[in-house]
């Protein structure tokens, strides 16, 4: 029932106002102007973004599960926002913990050599039967973001005349026959079809793909960043290890592919104030327009400290304009040499290319522990994962609308294949909510000084444990 407010007595009017003030505490507000879509609705729950007809409906909404859940989340968010700033001793302890973890969990040069040997061995085995192919190591082994137990990612480069599915079927047969590998299986229905096997000597799991050029380009980018920015590798390792502890890094179980965590760290370092990493495209490029960013394609790493880009106009309108121009030119009988000259000029303008630096000129002075805490805070409180896209190419924050991607869960753009959301494997709302909840627990855990014996906490101890980084060193502060 909609109340005719003009007929109310003073008592009733005050009663209505009081009820509305109470509702505001529950994030339900009276609409100044009614929405044209919901003409009967007088109120809006700003927390759940739901239109409500009247006071009775509002009281009913308050009792709903989702509203209660959102209220709790809001309360937790404000609690997290009001956590005191960490002391320098606390940050120093965190820095030590992250460095220790990177040493403890990351791969050593010896581990890398073992992985490179696996590729060399496999190259010999496969090239005996497929001499025109070559094998390359990619992924976390090459970027040095691998944990000790991480899979070995191997890609097969093959000539254009070869058929991709046939090639993988042949590789499956070759590896099955070899005594060097056990548990050889195919996973051709995966997003990236692979042959999976275990290297008998090292017991490491190998995932063999073919023609996975984009992944190799991303690997080169992340590896180069690891070399030029000292904080990058330990932060990624800590982040990956945390994700592994929380069971959110398994793509096959609806989690996030592990290299996404590296892109998330990269994005955070670009977005923090002041930034520690530059974006890959920007105003330093003459004529760059963020609205037309997809006309600039990233092409790979040069000199280990630059990313190469090319300008190719993909705008339909521009193509149509050029087509019309060409048609007009064709209709006019003109001197052939002159026509070719103007065409060449127009092509030159369209085929711009250049390189962008991977680092900023000013050296980083921020302690690693502070960055770890900021990273968790960024994804817990500052960056709306559901609303925006993690895009490492430009400084501007991309909305889902910009990409035409649905407003759900996590979106991470592949810098080399910009139509691909590399976090699309996280496709369950429940898993997404779990990820968000893990971020909150981790930020709370690392933001609060920890005692050696463990803090008395109201948090679920099992959850709290998952927030920890290193099994050896508890984070403590004096």
């Amino acid at each position: 029932t909609v109340i005719d407010e003009s007929a109310l007595t003073p008592e009733q009017r005050l009663g209505l106002k009081q009820a509305e003030e109470r509702l505001e505490r529950d994030h339900i507000f009276r609409l100044e102007k009614r929405s044209p879509e919901y003409t009967n609705c007088r109120y809006l729950c700003k927390l759940c973004l739901i239109h409500i007809e009247n006071i009775q409906g509002a009281h009913k909404h308050i009792k709903e599960k989702r509203h209660k859940k959102n209220i709790l989340e809001k309360q937790e968010e404000s609690e997290l926002r009001s956590l005191p700033s960490p002391s320098s001793a606390h940050l120093a302890a965190l820095s030590v913990a992250v460095v220790e973890l990177a040493k403890e969990q990351g791969i050593t040069d010896d581990d890398l050599r073992i992985r490179q040997d696996i590729v060399e061995e496999m190259s010999k085995v496969i090239m005996t039967f497929l001499p025109e192919c070559s094998l390359r190591l990619y992924g976390s082994s090459l970027t040095k973001f691998a944990l000790k137990s991480s899979d070995v990612n191997i890609d097969i480069k093959f000539p254009p005349k070869m058929n991709h599915p046939d090639l993988l079927i042949q590789v499956l047969g070759i590896l099955k026959k070899s005594a060097l590998y056990i548990d050889v299986e195919s996973d051709f229905h995966a997003k990236v079809p692979v042959v999976v096997c275990k290297d008998r000597k090292s017991a490491l799991l190998c995932r063999v793909s073919a023609g996975n050029d984009m992944a190799c380009l991303t690997t080169d980018l992340l590896a180069a960043l690891g070399k030029v920015e000292p904080v990058f590798t330990p932060l990624v390792l800590a982040f990956r290890y945390w994700a592994k502890l929380c069971y959110i890094d398994s793509q096959t179980d609806g989690g996030i592919p592990s290299y996404c965590f590296a892109l998330m760290v990269m994005f955070f370092l670009q977005q923090r104030k002041p930034p520690l990493l530059p974006c890959l495209l920007g105003s330093w490029i003459e004529g760059f327009d963020p609205k037309r960013m997809d006309d600039f394609q990233l092409k790979g790493i040069v000199e280990e400290k630059f990313v190469k880009w090319e300008y190719n106009s993909s705008s339909a309108t521009e193509k149509n304009l050029i087509a019309d121009e060409n048609k007009a030119k064709a209709d006019e009988p003109k001197d052939d040499t002159k026509k070719t000259e103007t065409d060449n000029q127009s092509n030159a303008a369209k085929a711009k290319h250049g390189k962008s630096p991977l680092t900023l000129e000013a050296p980083n002075q921020v302690p690693l522990g502070q960055l770890w805490l900021e990273l968790l805070k960024f994804y817990t409180l500052d960056f709306a994962l559901e609303e925006y896209v993690i895009c490492v190419r430009i400084q501007d924050i991309l909305t889902r609308e910009n990409k035409n991607w649905p407003k759900r869960r996590i979106a991470i753009e592949d810098p080399f294949s910009v139509k691909r959301n590399v976090a699309r494997s996280l496709n369950s709302q429940l898993v997404y909510e779990y990820v968000v909840e893990r971020f909150r627990a981790a930020y709370r855990y690392f933001a609060c000084p920890q005692k050696k014996g463990g803090n008395k906490s109201t948090m679920d101890p099992k959850k709290k444990e998952k927030g920890k980084l290193s099994s050896k060193k508890p984070v403590k502060s004096d």
Partner: nanobody, 118 residues
């Protein structure tokens, strides 16, 4: 159960001032509109002033500019500051606490006598 206890009534000369207080016991003070009613002999009880949790106020035309209602949510108390009193303000003043939603219910105080002599 909410209990309301008024104080501050008494005899005052015309043009004088009085301050009424009403202390509410019970933990749900914030749910209620708090107000003051009065009843003069042989007349109906009328709403003099009311105030919501957020401080929205109402005054009867006869007292506008002379009376001020305020509430202290921390102390569960509502006040009525009465200035420039007139003989026609003589009445028993009742403190009231009420809600309209989800349904109407009202709690009343015992009342306090205010007499304005000319």
């Amino acid at each position: 159960q909410v209990q309301l206890q008024e104080s501050g009534g008494g005899l005052v000369q015309a043009g004088g001032s009085l301050r009424l207080s009403c202390a509410a016991s019970g933990t749900i003070f914030t749910y209620f509109v708090m107000g003051w009613y009065r009843q003069a002999p042989g007349k109906e009880r009328e709403l003099v002033a009311g105030i919501t949790l957020g401080g929205t106020t109402y005054y009867a035309d006869s007292v506008k500019g002379r009376f001020t209602i305020s509430r202290d949510n921390a102390k569960n108390t509502v006040y009525l500051q009465m200035n420039s009193l007139k003989p026609e303000d003589t009445a028993v003043y009742y403190c009231a606490a009420w809600v309209e939603y989800p349904r109407r219910y009202v709690y009343w105080g015992q009342g306090t006598q205010v007499t304005v002599s000319s």
